[in-house]
Amino acid sequence: AAMGSCSKEYRMLLGQLQKQTDLMQDTSRLLDPYIRIQGLDIPKLREHCRESPGAFPSEETLRGLGRRGFLQTLNATLGRVLHRLADLEQHLPKAQDLERSGLNIEDLEKLQMARPNVLGLRNNVYCMAQLLDNSDMTEPTKAGRGTPQPPTPTPTSDVFQRKLEGCSFLRGYHRFMHSVGRVFSKWGESPNRSRR
């Protein structure tokens, strides 16, 4: 759902959330293009691209939250993700530079689709929270109570270090989306029943 329009149909909304998280855990949509564009597509460099511990909540943590707590955590985490993705985008090569160096422009387009897709997921998270009558969550088109602050990477002038940090973040993001998808897959057929 775009621009704050919400479906009142639980199963439809849950289906959309599951579909979105399925797409977002797919590394070919974000991490792989990033690795290619940033010239990290070398076995020796790839092995440095590991998820930073604590950057995202674990699946175990998410499972222990209950539906409302889970949606609130997901909303807050997606807010941070939007910032980190925008930050990564700022430091990507420009389209004309990619063409000159013979890299695939489609990879850049995939990366630039990530933020609107996260926005779409976040809107559906908000809608699901409304459906479960969770009044604590901010409407997606209004300012929130402040984005919870992430464990921010230490500022560095080292371009290579920045690329690796981006890579680690994206790896963690895909893993987190996989965990989110698994949590949603355990949700019951109705807003009131939970399969644990």
Epitope: A2, R84, L85, A86, D87, E89, N117, R122, A143, G144
Partner: antibody, heavy 121, light 111 residues
């Protein structure tokens, strides 16, 4: 009343520095990302920089990155723009603006009246 | 960077008549069902004021003679019946990616 008031503008020589401030009132400052937008005399509008609500993330126009630094002090309800290595083309009215809407896809709903920065020898 | 081309630069319209301003982006500013395009009005010696956000949403307090439409690369601001106070400059703004960029502006005048 929601209000943004800029200060710190003035005449500076090329290569010089200036620090602009923006005092916010009438809203919960720490809940909003904030931006600086400028307008050269008789010209159009140009986005300069944005800072996230908590200050962890900053975004810049390419030709000011490395010269300008946006920062904020939520305890003081204040936004800042530190401008170094100023050039003649930085001459403009600098507006402080509040960001609303979808995170990182904001638009500006409240603006200050602006402060004029003139870079000239 | 996305270049926003506004047209016309200047527009002369009779009071009570319809005024239409266009804005074309050098690449799509729409994605995932969202249109990241906004419209502003600026009176002489004043800061800009938002009229329309996300292509078609009327900002609170803005008269309903203003409307916005469009998606992808082409967007339109329409003033259904021009009033004397509308004779000022209008700008489009995209927020699809950083840097956000404004159109060059359209000066609306009375015919």
């Amino acid at each position: 009343e929601v209000q943004l008031v800029e200060s710190g503008g003035g005449l500076v020589q090329p290569g010089g520095s200036l620090r602009l401030s923006c005092a916010a009132s009438g809203f919960t400052f720490s809940n909003y990302a904030m931006s600086w937008v400028r307008q050269a005399p008789g010209k159009g509008l140009e986005w300069v920089a944005t800072i996230s609500d908590g200050g962890s993330f900053t975004y810049y126009l390419d030709n000011v990155r490395g010269r300008f630094t946006i920062s904020r002090d939520n305890a003081k309800n204040s936004l800042y723009l530190q401008m170094n290595s100023l050039r003649a083309e930085d001459t403009a009215v600098y507006y402080c603006a509040r960001d609303v809407g979808h995170t990182t896809f904001w638009y500006f709903d409240v603006w200050g009246r602006g402060t004029l920065v003139t870079v000239s020898s | 960077d996305i270049v926003m081309t506004q047209s016309p630069d200047s527009l002369a319209v009779s009071l009570g008549e319809r005024a239409t301003i266009n804005c074309r982006a050098s690449k799509s500013v729409s994605a995932a069902g969202y249109n990241f395009m906004h419209w502003y009005q600026q009176k002489p010696g004043q800061p800009p004021k938002v009229l329309i956000y996300y292509a078609s949403n009327l900002e609170s307090g803005v008269p309903d003679r203003f409307s916005g439409s469009g998606s992808g690369t082409d967007f339109t601001l329409t003033i259904s019946s021009l009033q004397a106070e509308d004779v000022v400059v209008y700008y489009c703004l995209h927020s699809r990616e950083f840097p956000f960029t404004f159109g060059g502006g359209t000066n609306v005048e009375i015919k």
